[in-house]
């Protein structure tokens, strides 16, 4: 055998007698004419040797130690090589040791390629004989992080100030790679972080540093668990001891990314959390121990990852294959923060990819399932775009704005279904015709239905909200000049039962200049409340809206404004209102920035109310609320 170590490798090879066996014949290392029982080879040296016996593996072991100094220069990060190559070494039980020394402020991360590592306790051994012993240091004190075998879940171990990794390979093992790499990280501000990755169901047993001896005083150790969101994790403590604390309290803390209750603090004697969905961290925090009688803190625990118990495996099909330009998002509804531990709530695609948010797009059929203790924690938001690019093709074309039944059958509440209606600029306008006449939501007459339609401009630069409308009113149709979004927003779970009341048809019609026209056909004995768009923010500058109010032949309409003055102050232009009888074309014009609003007026025939805004000064906006009431003509109106 020849071993030549590169001079800057900082490697020392030691061949020495292993545990003595009851073999009659001794064995020696032979160099030239000398017979020796221990050989040390340092960087830059070259030694040629043989053994005096046929089976040196029964007598000798080899240790290869590489010192990695990250204190005086850059650290050689990346994949760690087995150096010298195992093929150049005698076939002895071999231990490769990497001793990395770094500054206290530098984090070092050992990354283990697949197969990952499985921690073993005292007295246990690895089936294939390959063991990884990992230790760190606190000042001059060596801290054992643990001993590990292959085929486990531990993928990364982060430490700071230094790390010693020993890989023991039996003489017959063919392994020729270290199986890990070293990376630098920012300070982890704790003893170590162990990352454990679960690909599927399984369990991992893990131990505190120095186990079964005591965990270092007042230290913090963290385990990060990466768990597929469709599985559930439960933690159980197999064995623990508490030390005698003088200050602070020994505890474990759970951190669940995305949770509003972080960190969850538990005593070691508490029942530990179960049924956690997705990733979580567990930290062990020591205390300041009593100097006279410290006792020991130690912990051995198990994480069990399995498919959820007592939960429906029902799969829902969402068929969006015939839809275009549509996306459906299932997401957590906003909740008030609570300090209580809350299990995860997930939606899964094909039962494999689970997350707290899921967006489905049109053109495909999707299979979804839920992993959630309470589905009311989720809601759905849907967006669909209906656009017309060629005005010759779209004119007079109609589309039904209806929530597809597949979506209604999902066990999650629909929050918003938004249709974005896009038309070619200055070529076409839109008309919305509801299946049931609509009521405009006002403070005076609020909607109390399970859903409403929110109509707003979809032109990015334009801040124009036409209002919120619900079934059961007098608005027969709404015409809008240009792009709008119509959002069906639900307010109660009873929407499922009332879904039949929804239904809105949009048609592309010839272009008109007004921002919006509301066609109102009031019912007898009901008071219709109407208000200008952008209520509370004021009708946008230079915007014009109209109401076409129908009055049946045997009825009289009373038009009432709810304030004496409009309150608008114009910076430029004039704000005015025109009330025009449709039959006679007779009209009254009111200057809204000067005149008082008209007293209640009576109209025997259908009439128009048109309101046009000026450019108001800020804070003096145009907001008008008015009502229309029908009464039979026979009634004496004086």
């Amino acid at each position: 055998f020849e071993i030549a170590l590169p001079r800057e490798s900082n490697i020392t090879v030691l061949i020495k007698l292993g545990t003595p066996t009851l073999l009659a014949k001794p064995c020696y290392i032979v160099i030239s004419k000398r017979h020796i029982t221990m050989l040390s080879i340092k960087s830059g040296e070259r030694i040629v040797f043989t053994f005096s016996c046929q089976s040196p593996e029964n007598h000798f072991v080899i240790e290869i130690q590489k010192n990695i100094d990250c204190m005086s220069g850059p650290c050689p990060f990346g994949e760690v090589q087995l150096q010298p190559s195992t093929s150049l070494l005698p076939t002895l039980n071999r231990t490769f040791i990497w001793d990395v020394k770094a500054h206290k402020s530098i984090g070092l991360e050992l990354q283990f390629s697949i197969p990952r590592l499985r921690q073993i306790g005292p007295g246990e051994s690895c089936p294939d004989g390959v063991t990884h012993s990992i230790s760190g240091r606190i000042d001059a004190t060596v801290v054992r992080i643990g001993t590990f075998c292959s085929n486990g879940t531990v993928s990364r171990i982060k430490m700071q100030e230094g790390v010693k990794m020993a890989l023991h390979l039996p003489w017959f093992h063919p392994r020729n790679v270290s199986g890990f790499s070293i990376a630098n990280r920012s300070s982890i501000k704790r003893l170590c972080i162990i990352e454990s990755v679960f690909e599927g169901e399984g369990s991992a047993t893990l131990m505190s540093a120095n186990y079964p001896e005591g965990f270092p005083e007042d230290e913090l150790m963290t385990w990060q668990f990466v768990v597929p969101a469709h599985l559930r994790a439960s933690v159980s403590f197999l064995n623990f001891n508490l030390s005698n604390c003088e200050r602070k309290e020994e505890r474990v803390e759970y951190y669940i990314p995305g949770s509003t209750t972080n960190p969850e603090v538990f005593k070691l004697e508490d029942k530990q959390p179960g049924n956690m969905a997705g990733n979580f961290n567990l930290s062990l925090q020591g205390c300041d121990q009593d100097a006279q009688s410290p006792g020991i803190l130690r912990l051995q625990f198990q994480v069990l990852v399995q498919h959820p118990q007592n939960e429906s495996n029902k799969i829902y099909v969402v068929d969006l294959s015939n839809e275009r330009a549509m996306s459906l998002t299932i997401e957590p509804r906003p909740v008030k923060q609570s300090r209580k531990f809350v299990p995860g709530c997930f939606v899964c695609l094909e039962s494999r990819t689970c997350s707290s948010n899921l967006t489905l797009t049109s053109g495909s059929k999707h299979k979804i399932s839920f992993l959630c203790d309470d589905l009311t924690r989720l809601w759905m938001n849907v967006e669909k775009t209906i656009s017309c690019t060629d005005h010759r093709y779209c004119q007079r074309k109609s589309y039904s704005l209806q929530v597809p039944s597949d979506i209604l059958h999902l066990p999650v509440e629909l929050h918003d279904f938004s249709w974005k209606l896009l038309v070619p600029k200055d070529r076409l306008s839109l008309v919305l015709v509801p299946a049931q006449k609509l009521q405009q939501h006002t403070h005076e007459k609020p909607c109390n239905t399970s859903f409403s339609y929110l109509v707003a401009s979809a032109i990015p630069s334009q801040d124009l909200y036409f209002g919120s409308f619900c079934p059961g009113g007098s608005i027969k149709q709404i015409q809008v000049k240009q792009n709008i979004s119509v959002t069906l927003r639900t307010f109660a779970p009873s929407f499922q039962q009332e879904a039949s009341r929804q239904g809105l048809t949009v048609s592309f019609i010839p272009y008109f200049k007004e921002e919006g026209v509301f066609t109102v056909t009031p019912d007898t004995k009901s008071k219709v409340y109407l208000r200008t768009p952008n209520w509370d923010r004021g009708l946008p500058s230079l915007t014009s809206v109209s109401w076409n109010i129908s009055v049946p032949r045997d009825q009289v309409a009373c038009l009432t404004f709810f304030k004496e003055r409009s309150g608008v102050v114009c910076q430029t232009g004039r704000a005015f209102m025109i009330i025009q009888e449709q039959r006679t074309r007779a009209e009254e014009i009111f200057s809204l920035d000067e005149d008082v609003l008209p007293k209640p007026s009576f109209h025997h025939h259908s009439f128009w109310v048109n309101i046009s805004n000026c450019s108001p000064t800020s804070g003096k906006q145009l907001d008008l609320l008015f009502s229309v009431t029908l009464t039979p003509r026979t009634v004496d109106l004086t």
Epitope: A4, R34, L39, S40, G44, E45, R46
Partner: antibody, heavy 120, light 112 residues
Amino acid sequence: EVQLVESGGGLVQPGGSLRLSCAASGFTFSRYWMNWVRQAPGKGLEWVANIKQDGSEKDYVDSVKGRFTISRDNAKNSLFLQMSSLRAEDTAVYYCARVMYSSGWSFDYWGQGTLVTVSS
Amino acid sequence: DIVMTQSPLSLPVTPGEPASISCRSSRSLLHSSGYNFLDWFLQKPGQSPQLLIFLGSDRASGVPDRFSGSGSGTDFTLKISRVETEDVGVYYCMQALQTPITFGQGTRLEIK
């Protein structure tokens, strides 16, 4: 009989390059570490570089690192030293030397040397 | 790097008389194997160096037995029991323990 014969020396200007060769015979070349050692006129011996049997490991004296490259062709029983960015202080007789098979870095055979003169 | 220091730098000797050259290393050349990795070379005028002694005291093949090497750790000696005229040249010690391999400055042996 073991023989090492160097060639390729000559006069070269500072900053120039030169490639030295060493032809080996009389032994199994691929089993031995090989070295280049130099001797400046009237001065002592200075080890320059070495190369492992299969060429997988190489080492150099600090003063030539990054400028000189040692290589070998076991099929042709040849050792090479590619020298670039030559300086006046590289002027020397360059010897190729074989490392003994036993432990350590002992040189049991040397070539006759080839003179490299770096001068403008 | 290990520094090798030889003395004397020049050694005039009468043929038939013994000669001794000393070599000191800045670090011990005694290996865990029990060997001292120190070699001695002779470079005759106009020739390339030839190995005399390796591993501190082992004579290379073909080297007359009037040459012997001794010492351990950091102090070594090359002895010529009876100098002959053909022994003229420069003697170098070399540490063969680790790279970079280093030589002593050389001791010039000349006939009185």
